[in-house]
């Protein structure tokens, strides 16, 4: 006979997993807030900027009470994937003006990627149904001008900030229900 079976693998405490996800999200939120402020200092925004390709905000703060964990994580992952794609696009096609936001924009991209991997891990640890593979997204058109890239940056960082703020609140609320 082979060696005796080892002890059963204990799945990590989902609350601890959720905690580390909250910490990553909160850290990314602070980074985004600071980078958005840096952008406003360098290129003051003339009003609010929108980008049609960005996801709409997942939830108003008032509607947080009705949230369920699978829905929150699936939606958050989808939205953050979209923001990751937009940050990558911004770094690639945003123009020379936005080079002044490096290396911070690169750090933001890396941390966003890390948070997405953490969310994926959390979903598997919680045995939540894995979302289907993302359909290939249509390529984002390059900004029409340097100012177009700056406007896009305002929209992306502003939207990401709101999304992460919603995410921190939602995840903390969900933690109390685990």
């Amino acid at each position: 006979p082979g060696p005796p079976p080892g002890p059963p693998r204990v799945s990590p405490d989902p609350r601890a997993e959720l905690d580390s996800t909250v910490l990553l999200t909160r850290s990314l939120l602070a980074d985004t807030r600071q980078l958005a402020a840096q952008l406003r200092d360098k290129f003051p925004a003339d009003g609010d900027h929108n980008l049609d390709s960005l996801p709409t905000l997942a939830m108003s703060a008032g509607a947080l009470g009705a949230l369920q964990l699978p829905g929150v994580l699936t939606r958050l992952r989808a939205d953050l994937l979209s923001y990751l794609r937009h940050v990558q696009w911004l770094r690639r096609a945003g123009g020379s003006s936005l080079k002044t936001l490096e290396p911070e924009l690169g750090t933001l991209q890396a941390r966003l990627d890390r948070l997405l991997r953490r969310l994926q891990l959390l979903m598997s640890r919680l045995a939540l149904p894995q979302p289907p593979p993302d359909p290939p997204a249509p390529p984002l058109a390059p900004p029409s001008s340097a100012w177009g890239g700056i406007r896009a940056a305002h929209a992306i960082l502003g939207g990401l900030h709101l999304t992460l703020d919603w995410a921190v609140r939602g995840l903390l609320l969900l933690k109390t229900r685990l």
């Epitope: 905690d19 910490l23 909160r26 850290s27 958005a36 406003r40 003051p44």
Partner: antibody, heavy 120, light 108 residues
């Protein structure tokens, strides 16, 4: 050597106004975010307001929002706090403070403070 | 807002003893956003420890910080007479930035 020197404190009646100044030297003022922090007599520290290097992002504590205005003049290496509709509970020593080298490293440099007394 | 609660409110120790000051945070915060300050009577606060465990410039090695999540600690390994003061923790991850109410370290 980094130096921050506050001025403009004094005695003011409730409902009155006061403008505090903070003169900065020994560093490139236009490169750093700046804060005002206050301390009521015998009490702890309370953060009041923050302004980014280019003045385009400003945050306030809820207790002063709508009454206080933080501003800066990078050409004069100066930070300001305009305080309107003053209340007795605004009585405190007001400090200006500079962030360390990054925004997430705490308030590394402080002035000596200026006392604001709101009383009739 | 994020609330920081320091304990004990007052700590009475003798020079040479070890001091352990606690800061409990109402929400989980990343450790890079937790800082400690020292304030002596009639003086401005002084940054002691930033990002939970990094000593600020000129701070002696007897001061150290640790912690994560919601529980953070400032330790003074062997108290010197000049260490008796009030100590504050502060978070910088969320606006409004907030301080703990302080721990007064006094000579026994």
């Amino acid at each position: 050597e980094v130096q921050l020197v506050e001025s403009g404190g004094g005695l003011v009646q409730p409902g009155g106004s006061l403008r505090l100044s903070c003169a900065a030297s020994g560093f490139t003022f236009s490169s750093f975010g700046m804060h005002w922090v206050r301390q009521a007599p015998g009490k702890g520290l309370e953060w009041v307001a923050y302004i980014t290097p280019g003045s385009n992002t400003i945050y306030y504590a809820d207790t002063v929002k709508g009454r206080f205005t933080i501003s800066r003049d990078n050409a004069k290496n100066s930070l300001y706090l305009q305080m309107n509709s003053l209340r007795a509970e605004d009585t405190a020593v007001y400090y200006c403070a500079r962030e360390y080298y990054s925004y997430d490293e705490g308030f590394a440099y402080w002035g000596q403070g200026t006392l604001v007394t709101v009383s009739s | 807002e994020i609330v920081l609660t320091q304990s004990p409110a007052t700590l009475s120790l003798s020079p040479g003893e070890r001091a352990t000051l606690s800061c409990s945070v109402s929400d989980l915060i990343p450790s890079q956003y937790l800082h400690w300050y020292q304030q002596k009577p009639g003086q401005a606060p002084r940054l002691l420890i930033y990002r939970t465990s990094n000593r600020a410039s000129g701070i002696p090695a007897r001061f150290s910080g640790s912690g994560s999540g919601t529980d953070f600690t400032l330790t003074i390994s062997s108290l010197e007479p000049e260490d008796f003061a009030v100590y504050y923790c502060q978070q910088g991850v969320d606006v409004p930035f907030t301080f703990g109410q302080g721990t007064k370290l006094e000579i026994k």
